[in-house]
Interface confidence: low
């Protein structure tokens, strides 16, 4: 009696269990009473990456220079390429289709996690005690200078955006 | 056609810059990443780094980081050099390459097109 | 970084003989995906670097068919069948795995 369902890494047709081609390959032709499942090595810049009975394998993604994007790991015949964004510049989804630039920080406010390739900067605001003065995707929140330590005084309150202002003591008269 | 035309021979004083541009055209510029690779008089081939001309992303070599810049106008499609701090032995014939970049083979990126050369003398 | 090591680094021939040219890296060249990351460029007297062979052994655009390469891992070989006085300067091989790309020293091929 013909089998109505098959083994791992087998696929029913004809009434009968042909084997799958491995990761790396697709399907030629397939198998017969007579015959195994005849498979072929993708192309140089082709990939499968299950065992399968595709006719065509896959393409590489292309990482298009246009769109910021590089190499971050050669296909083979078993992967896909991998892109990933230029230096400065973050993944705009998961699969890293095109790239943006990374976020600065206003003043106000501070780095709280630096992008990477794949998510943009995190920001968050300068808490009372710490400032930051500049627009930037890597300077965090710096603290407001300690006057006291210098041997100084506070002049000049500080802001979520300025340092205070230190200045020596008044002159005793 | 597709082409590299580089700027004349520089003749520069130790410690000083010089900077060399190349420019491209009969292709899309920003398509194509941009090396620089130099050779000494009897010395044999080395590579500096590259520039991505699309988003000006860079990769030096290490021996030149902290002395090379490249960067790029898109809008007049050229790449430029410049070497800081010139040392008598940066004595060289510096060429612009442009690296093939696509799908076939297997994305592997070669140098096909080169510029005709920029002779930079270091001499004081 | 990768070292390359070309020999002979002269190489007199005479017209219509073949010549060879080795080249050996101090790593694997071979990646993942079977292919090597290996190139040949020749540096003709007056000109700029011209691709001849990628991949270790295929054939550049325009290349003419007696340059042929061949090898795997960390050992190549460019081959010139019936050499041509056109073919005399300087063969270098260059890996192009990992940045930075690096050359071989240079093989001189000058006609007897």
């Known amino acids: 009696e013909p089998p109505t369902a098959c083994r791992e890494k087998q696929y029913l047709i004809n009434s009968q269990c042909c084997s799958l081609c491995q990761p790396g390959q697709k399907l030629v032709s397939d198998c017969t009473e007579f015959t195994e499942t005849e498979c072929l090595p993708c192309g140089e810049s082709e990939f499968l990456d299950t065992w399968n009975r595709e006719t065509h394998c896959h393409q590489h993604k292309y990482c298009d220079p246009n769109l910021g994007l590089r190499v971050q790991q050669k296909g083979t015949s078993e992967t896909d390429t991998i892109c990933t964004c230029e230096e400065g510049w973050h993944c705009t989804s998961e699969a890293c289709e095109s790239c943006v630039l990374h976020r600065s920080c206003s003043p106000g406010f501070g780095v709280k996690q630096i992008a990477t390739g794949v998510s943009d900067t995190i920001c968050e605001p300068c808490p009372v005690g710490f400032f930051s003065n500049v627009s930037s995707a890597f300077e965090k929140c710096h603290p407001w200078t300690s006057c006291e330590t210098k041997d100084l005084v506070v002049q000049q309150a500080g802001t979520n955006k300025t340092d205070v202002v230190c200045g020596p003591q008044d002159r005793l008269r | 056609q597709v082409q590299l035309v580089q700027s004349g021979a520089e003749v520069k004083k130790p410690g000083a810059s010089v900077k060399v541009s190349c420019k491209a055209s009969?292709?899309?510029?920003?398509?194509?990443?941009m090396h620089w690779v130099r050779q000494a008089p009897g010395q044999g081939l080395e590579w500096m780094g590259w520039?991505?001309?699309?988003?000006?992303?860079?990769n030096y070599a290490q021996k030149f980081q902290g002395r090379v810049t490249m960067t790029r106008d898109t809008s007049i499609s050229t790449a430029y050099m410049e070497l800081s701090r010139l040392r008598s032995d940066d004595t060289a014939v510096y060429y612009c390459a442009r690296e093939r970049v696509g799908a076939t083979p297997t994305y592997y990126y070669y140098m096909d097109v080169w510029g005709k050369g920029t002779t930079v003398t270091v001499s004081s | 970084d990768v070292v390359m090591t070309q020999s002979p680094l002269s190489l007199p021939v005479t017209p219509g003989e073949s010549a060879t040219i080795s080249c050996r890296s101090s790593?694997?060249?071979?990646?993942?995906?079977?292919?090597?990351?290996l190139d040949w460029y020749l540096l003709k007297p007056g000109q700029s670097p011209q691709l001849l062979i990628y991949?270790?052994?295929n054939r550049a655009s325009g290349v003419p068919d007696r340059f042929s390469g061949s090898g795997s891992g960390t050992d190549f070989t460019l081959k010139i069948s019936r050499v041509e006085a056109e073919d005399v300067g300087l063969y270098y091989c260059m890996q192009g795995l990992e940045t930075p790309y690096t050359f071989g020293q240079g093989t001189k091929l000058e006609i007897k």
């Open positions: 991949l270790g052994s």
């Open positions: 009969g292709y899309t510029f920003t398509g194509y990443y």
């Open positions: 520039i991505n001309p699309n988003s000006g992303g860079t």
């Open positions: 790593q694997s060249l071979l990646y993942s995906n079977g292919y090597n990351y």
